[in-house]
């Protein structure tokens, strides 16, 4: 066992001479992004104050390619890197095409309405006039491709012109536009060469030791790893913590059960019920508030102030009133909960599926005519699963090195 331990320690660290270095640099696991849209069935009725009715469409599946660049080894046992992602639509794995039309809330209009609720009435009336002039409505009918990667909207230019610096989009607006062909920030992580106990843990993200999106030091902490590998020699008492640039926060997953993936022993880690709980149910989350119902996290502070919320799909594990407020939602543990299966000896993921939902809080706002009589509701826009499983040559090598070899050496 000590020989095995030495081998593991030698080969998991981030070092060009270690066996796992290339695996860390160019993740050989095929990752897929599966996106499910909530097609709004009754937009006109919602504007009259009726309950929203949605139909889940999808999956629209994309192969996700990741590669690290600008890899720089620092002299404090850390390495800095940028990781770029590109997405390629997979028609054969998808239920529909990127040219499918989806009726969705117009995030720019309804988001701006809620953001301006407490602004002077005059400003809201000016926005109403601007929306009318530009032909903007509360709901839009756009293709999957447009929603994902961006569509030209005169409102984007208007926002950039009259509210400069507020908006990260320049010409087009798309929910995943910022992710494609771009990096998720400069990560600086510990290599484990000098101190294995800190391997993969994030030292800094974009040069920051903590973020300032939230209202408490605890919520602003950058904890855990960058979400791809963890320190070796895990136990059932270990937790799986990582910083997610997309959620603008650190997340902690808990051990659920032991299992086996393609002959390799694994630990399954899942989201605790408290992950998106509000501050009154789970006080450490108070820093993420102001909160609505429990089970959804307000990410407006890191998403151009738009009233966007992150949760489990179909409001799984959230306050039941959220799913009850929208017809067509059916939360299901099996289908909608996220998991990561980790090989505990190395801290390397074997099989994972991270599932999250993005929703928009919308309501009627006096002075903004486009919002009609919309009753306040958190309306799901889409949910996605980012999934990957080790396979092929990589799996064979891993199995040989970490399962067969130790068995042979044991005898």
């Amino acid at each position: 066992p000590s020989l095995i331990k030495q081998q593991v320690l030698k080969n998991v660290r981030i070092d060009p001479s270690s066996l796992s270095f290339n695996m860390w640099k160019e993740i050989p696991i095929p990752f897929y992004l599966s996106v499910y849209f909530f097609d709004v069935m009754n937009p006109s009725e919602i504007l009259k104050g009726e309950k929203p009715q949605v139909r889940e469409r999808g999956p629209y599946v994309y192969r996700e390619f990741r590669h690290k660049s600008n890899i720089t080894f620092n002299n404090n046992d850390t390495v800095s890197f940028l990781e770029y992602r590109t997405f390629q639509f997979q028609p054969s794995k998808s239920h529909g095409s990127e040219s499918d039309y989806i009726v969705m809330p117009n995030i720019l209009v309804l988001g701006a309405a809620v953001m301006m609720e407490n602004k002077p009435m005059t400003l809201k009336l000016i926005m109403t006039l601007a929306f009318t002039t530009l032909g903007e409505r509360a709901f839009m009918n756009r293709t999957v491709g447009e929603i994902m990667w961006g569509y030209k909207d005169p409102l984007v230019n208007l926002i950039n012109k009259y509210f400069p610096g507020m908006f990260p989009f320049k010409d087009k607006f798309g929910l995943f536009a910022e992710l494609n062909n771009s990096d998720s920030g400069l990560f600086t992580v510990f290599t484990g060469v000098q101190n294995i106990s800190r391997i993969h843990l994030v030292d800094k993200w974009n040069g920051l030791s903590k973020v300032d999106f939230w209202h408490s030091d605890q919520c602003n902490m950058i904890n855990g790893t960058s979400g791809q590998m963890w320190p070796p020699f895990m136990t059932p008492e270990s937790s799986l913590e990582f910083y997610s640039p997309e959620a603008c926060r650190s997340m902690k997953l808990m051990y659920k059960e032991s299992g086996v993936f393609e002959g390799i022993p694994t630990y399954r880690f899942v989201a605790p019920k408290t992950l998106f709980a509000n501050g009154s149910i789970y006080p450490p989350n108070e820093g993420f508030c102001p909160c609505l119902e429990s089970g959804i996290q307000n990410v407006s502070t890191c998403r151009f102030s738009a009233p966007l919320f992150l949760s489990h799909p179909h409001f799984l594990n959230a306050d039941p009133v959220l799913a009850e407020a929208v017809t067509g939602l059916h939360p299901n543990q099996e289908a909608h909960s996220l998991f990561l299966d980790i090989h505990p000896v190395t801290g390397i993921p074997m099989n994972c599926s991270v599932k999250l939902q993005l929703s928009l809080y919308m309501k009627s706002v006096a002075g903004i005519g486009q919002t009609g009589k919309i009753e306040p509701v958190v309306l799901p826009l889409l949910w996605f699963a980012e999934s990957g499983a080790m396979e092929g040559e990589t799996l064979h090598t891993f199995y040989t090195q970490l399962v067969l070899m130790p068995k042979v050496m044991h005898y």
Epitope: N118, K119, P120, M121, T122, L123, L125, I126, M127, L129, A130, L158, K161, Y162, F163, P164, G367
Partner: antibody
């Protein structure tokens, strides 16, 4: 060509009501927001309030209790009524068109003197 | 008393560059965009700069605006005699909930 023209009495007695009308030509009054701004002699500009064609108003907090604005879409005019005036209300009163850009078009202004 | 503070006067000789400042707070300039108005003697004000630094058509590019934090400034380069006027900054204010103006700066071309 958009034009705004203020009209109303140039002299108002203290404690009485100041009434002004702004005639809008060259554009429908329903297309924008309309404002009143005043400038006391030798002083800066002071925003009075805005009105939307539907009648929704937004008043300066300091004048709110004495102010009433109205709009008449049939004549393409909007009006201002300021009650219980004092010498401090003596000013040049401008009507203006308000867009996202700001006060984009102005009338030439009308001087209202409050004096007995 | 104006909520936005401007120097009462400024001056320069033809061809010079002059800057006029406008300072406010987080409830106005800090959370809004700034407009600048020019008022030539005996006339109504005219929109000169909107959204901090945008010029309406017809305004010469000698006029430029900028904003940083809770302050804004108007710069006039290549000063000309016809630039002699009063200049006012304006912004939305969230606390009194309306439009506020600066006290105005009288620009003299020497």
């Amino acid at each position: 060509q958009l034009q705004l023209q203020e009209s109303g009495p140039g002299l108002v007695r203290p404690s009485e009501t100041l009434s002004l009308t702004c005639n809008v030509s060259g554009v429908s009054i329903s297309d924008d927001l309309w404002s009143w701004i005043r400038q006391s002699p030798g002083k800066g500009l002071e925003w009075i309030g805005n009105i939307y064609y539907s009648g929704i108003t937004d008043y300066s907090p300091s004048l709110k209790s004495r102010l009433r604005m109205s709009v008449d879409t049939s004549t393409n005019q909007f009006s201002l009524r300021l009650s219980s005036v004092t010498a401090a209300d003596t000013a040049v009163y401008f009507c203006a068109r308000l867009t996202l850009r700001g006060f984009q078009n102005w009338g030439q202004g009308t001087l209202v003197t409050v004096s007995s | 008393q104006s909520v936005l503070t401007q120097p009462p006067s400024a001056s320069g000789t033809p061809g010079q560059r002059v800057t006029i400042s406008c300072s406010g707070s987080s409830s106005n300039i800090g959370s809004s965009t700034v407009n600048w108005y020019q008022q030539l003697p005996g006339t109504a004000p005219k929109l000169l700069i909107y959204s901090n630094n945008q010029r309406p058509s017809g305004v010469p590019d000698r006029f430029s605006g900028s904003k940083s934090g809770t302050s804004a400034s108007l710069a006039i380069s290549g000063l000309q005699s016809e630039d002699e006027a009063d200049y006012f900054c304006a912004a939305w204010d969230d606390s009194p909930n309306g439009v506020i103006f600066g006290g105005g700066t009288k620009l003299t071309v020497l």
